[in-house]
């Protein structure tokens, strides 16, 4: 990657981070009456998430994420869940590249939507701070 492509990657990661934080803030909103129900849904967590290729694991969970977000009141988000997830999907596909043979491996234990989002927020922050 060139310095310009790395800069583009950094910007994409920052957009991904903001989108994930917006979702987390939306579902954690004290006015969200569906939070208790949303927390009953389980998400698969990556066995490891340190590099861009590990975004394969996030991509595979975007559909379940959209389905859970559809439970929330739409006013908690600036965009409809379908549009929000579509935006994330575009970023993820660009970031992880076209290495189609890379298969995700998941951790043994599942997580709530809050734990899931926090994991990918941590991932985004760490890549932003270490990508050179």
């Amino acid at each position: 990657p060139t310095s310009s492509s790395t800069k583009k990657t950094q910007l994409q990661l920052e957009h991904l981070l903001l989108d994930l934080q917006m979702i987390l803030n939306g579902i954690n909103n004290y006015k969200n009456p569906k939070l208790t129900r949303m927390l009953t849904f389980k998400f698969y967590m990556p066995k490891k998430a340190t590099e861009l290729k590990h975004l394969q694991c996030l991509e595979e969970e975007l559909k379940p994420l959209e389905e859970v977000l559809n439970l929330a009141q739409s006013k908690n988000f600036h965009l409809r869940p379908r549009d929000l997830i579509s935006n994330i999907n575009v970023i993820v596909l660009e970031l992880k590249g076209s290495e189609t043979t890379f298969m995700c491996e998941y951790a043994d234990e599942t997580a709530t939507i809050v734990e899931f989002l926090n994991r990918w927020i941590t991932f985004s922050q760490s890549i932003i701070s270490t990508l050179t």
């Epitope: 990657t9 490891k48 590099e51 861009l52 890379f102 760490s126 890549i127 990508l131």
Partner: antibody
Framework: EVQLVESGGGLVQPGGSLRLSCAAS????????LAWVRQAPGKGLEWVAA???????YSPDTVRGRFTISRDNAKNSLYLQMNSLRAEDTAVYYC???????????WGQGTTVTVSS | DIVMTQSQKFMSTSVGDRVSVTCKAS??????VGWYQQKPGQSPKALIY???FRYSGVPSRFSGSGSGTDFTLTISSLQPEDFATYYC?????????FGGGTKLEIK
């Protein structure tokens, strides 16, 4: 059998440069993330840099802007270009393979870098 | 950055002892922890990954446990070749970080 062999270490003056190499064999080199880890005399281990299979590079604040990790998949080789060296960079530098889903599973024997005037 | 703390720098032990080396992470790292053995003048050797899984060829007397922030490497019956320094490492996020190491010394 997986093998990692480092070379290129030596004595260099503060402010100087050095290029370390790591020759890999026994695995599909291009499919793995590779890392450099260093160990100062009598101290613990410190992660220095990593490069993934797409050649994206990662490093901590301590070396960013001074050290550059790169790879040549055709030669099954990993490199660490070290510039603006300081006394505190004195260490044994290890090349390690980062398994896709687990820890650093194979390590080279190390090469010694001494920064001193 | 995540700080990995091995509170015991040295442990005085004897052959045949059951030894537990502990490591604490400054934040939740799930089970993304590896353990390494290093003997003087040698490079680190990977023992454990995912907190509790032994690498191929690692003797069964070595075991790992823990998740979240607290991790333990246990040697069920210490052998003469086990006197070495042991490091934990988190690979939950970059930058990877290591514990300061625990050196097993002969009592």
């Amino acid at each position: 059998e997986v093998q990692l062999v480092e070379s290129g270490g030596g004595l260099v003056q503060p402010g100087g440069s050095l290029r370390l190499s790591c020759a890999a064999s026994g695995f599909t080199f291009s499919s793995y993330t590779l890392a450099w880890v260093r160990q100062a005399p009598g101290k613990g281990l410190e992660w220095v840099a990593a490069i993934d299979s797409s050649s994206y590079t990662y490093s901590p604040d301590t070396v960013r802007g001074r050290f550059t990790i790169s790879r040549d998949n055709a030669k099954n080789s990993l490199y660490l270009q070290m510039n603006s060296l300081r006394a505190e960079d004195t260490a044994v530098y290890y090349c390690a393979r980062d398994s896709n889903w687990d820890a650093l599973d194979y390590w080279g024997q190390g090469t010694t870098v001494t920064v001193s005037s | 950055d995540i700080v990995m703390t091995q509170s015991q720098k040295f442990m005085s032990t004897s052959v045949g002892d059951r030894v537990s080396v502990t490591c604490k992470a400054s934040q939740n790292v799930g089970t993304n922890v590896g353990w390494y053995q290093q003997k003087p003048g040698q490079s680190p050797k990977a023992l454990i990954y995912s907190a509790s899984f032994r690498y191929s060829g690692v003797p069964s007397r070595f075991s790992g446990s823990g998740s979240g922030t607290d991790f333990t490497l246990t040697i069920s019956s210490l052998q003469p070749e086990d006197f070495a320094t042991y490091y934990c490492q988190q690979y939950y996020t970059y930058p990877y970080t290591f514990g300061g190491g625990t050196k097993l010394e002969i009592k």
